[in-house]
């Protein structure tokens, strides 16, 4: 009955503060409408990073001001989070909701630990 969600345990953000990972869910039924939410957990506090609802076969659309982008392929969602800094290092949880058709299913991943290292400032050249 429970929906399994898989995501990588660890991801290292690029020097430009971009981190990408795949969120894959084992759909118990044939969902046509799916909601994907990225949550950040820090000190047992959970906050929403971004969210998108999409129809199967269509593109994933986040809000214009979102720091996330993504693409979907079947039961797999490729997520990219941009603008990350060292202080954003933490556990990022992929949450999947099968909104339609019934029944509703909720799937929570174990989380991806994203490490972000701020780039060293370039030394002044003489």
């Amino acid at each position: 009955k429970a929906m399994h969600v898989a995501q990588p345990a660890v991801v290292l953000a690029s020097s430009r503060g971009i981190a990408s990972f795949v969120c894959e869910y084992a759909s118990p039924g044939k969902a046509t409408e799916v909601r994907v939410t990225v949550l950040r957990q820090a000190d047992s506090q959970v906050t929403e990073v971004c969210a998108a609802t999409y129809m199967m076969g269509n593109e994933l659309t986040f809000l214009d001001d979102s720091i996330c982008t993504g693409t979907s392929s079947g039961n797999q969602v490729n997520l990219t989070i941009q603008g990350l800094r060292a202080m954003d290092t933490g556990l990022y949880i992929c949450k999947v909701e099968l909104m339609y058709p019934p029944p509703y299913y909720l799937g929570i991943g174990n989380g991806t630990q994203i490490y972000v290292i701020d780039p060293e400032p370039c030394p002044d050249s003489d």
Epitope: A2, L39, M99, P102, P103, Y104, L106, I108
Partner: antibody, heavy 118, light 108 residues
Framework: QVQLVESGGGVVQPGRSLRLSCAAS????????MHWVRQAPGKGLEWVTF????????YYADSVKGRFTISRDNSKNTLYLQMNSLRAEDTAIYYC???????????WGQGTLVTVSS | EIVLTQSPGTLSLSPGERATLSCRAS???????LAWYQQKPGQAPRLLIY???SRATGIPDRFSGSGSGTDFTLTISRLEPEDFAVYYC?????????FGQGTKVEIK
């Protein structure tokens, strides 16, 4: 702080209608799915209905399907429950509840009592 | 529909004692989708445990949850006077959302 305040309960005759409201404050209402849960006098908790973020998707318990309608107005931060064709067995305290980020019902209103009696 | 059965129906204990409440599901529930609530007379339910073993904000550490699959347990290590109440388990992994019938923890 998060607050959910129900209103609209009262005494109503069988077969009549009633509309409950739940005013939400202290959080971004449109970012959360919501539920109504009821509790008959001296009994346990019974889930009644669910509504998605934008109100597009709704789910109902078999006991109320076709009689109750859940809706929301995100511009007013308010959740509603329209109850038609009320029966004596619908007598209960009705609670609105917020779905937490990880799925459980993390905040509940204080409840509003609905009594269906002739 | 996932049916949750709680036992015992009533637990009579004294303050300071350990309380062990059981919740059994009719089919497997992922541990991420099992919650426990506390309800006192005249009050709304309060979330205690989610994800089978994570304590909600502000819940004292004498409350702990465990279990997986179909068998889950809520343990109160040392009962305080304010812990005497009714406790409900709930699954939230799929619709319809379901609750157990409750366990009343009363003063012996």
């Amino acid at each position: 702080q998060v607050q959910l305040v129900e209103s609209g309960g009262g005494v109503v005759q069988p077969g009549r209608s009633l509309r409950l409201s739940c005013a939400a404050s202290g959080f971004t209402f449109s970012h959360y799915t919501m539920h109504w849960v009821r509790q008959a006098p001296g009994k346990g908790l019974e889930w009644v209905t669910f509504i998605s973020y934008d109100g597009h998707n709704k789910y109902y318990a078999d006991s109320v399907k076709g009689r109750f309608t859940i809706s929301r107005d995100n511009s007013k931060n308010t959740l509603y429950l329209q109850m038609n064709s009320l029966r004596a067995e619908d007598t209960a305290i009705y609670y609105c509840a917020r779905t937490g980020w990880l799925g459980p019902f993390d905040y509940w209103g204080q409840g509003t009592l609905v009594t269906v009696s002739s | 529909e996932i049916v949750l059965t709680q036992s015992p129906g009533t637990l009579s204990l004294s303050p300071g004692e350990r309380a062990t409440l059981s919740c059994r599901a009719s089919q497997s529930v992922g541990s991420s989708y099992l919650a426990w609530y506390q309800q006192k007379p005249g009050q709304a339910p309060r979330l205690l445990i989610y994800g089978a073993f994570s304590r909600a904000t502000g819940i004292p550490d004498r409350f702990s949850g465990s279990g997986s699959g179909t068998d889950f347990t809520l343990t109160i290590s040392r009962l305080e006077p304010e812990d005497f109440a009714v406790y409900y388990c709930q699954q939230y992994g799929s619709s319809p959302w379901t609750f157990g019938q409750g366990t009343k923890v009363e003063i012996k």
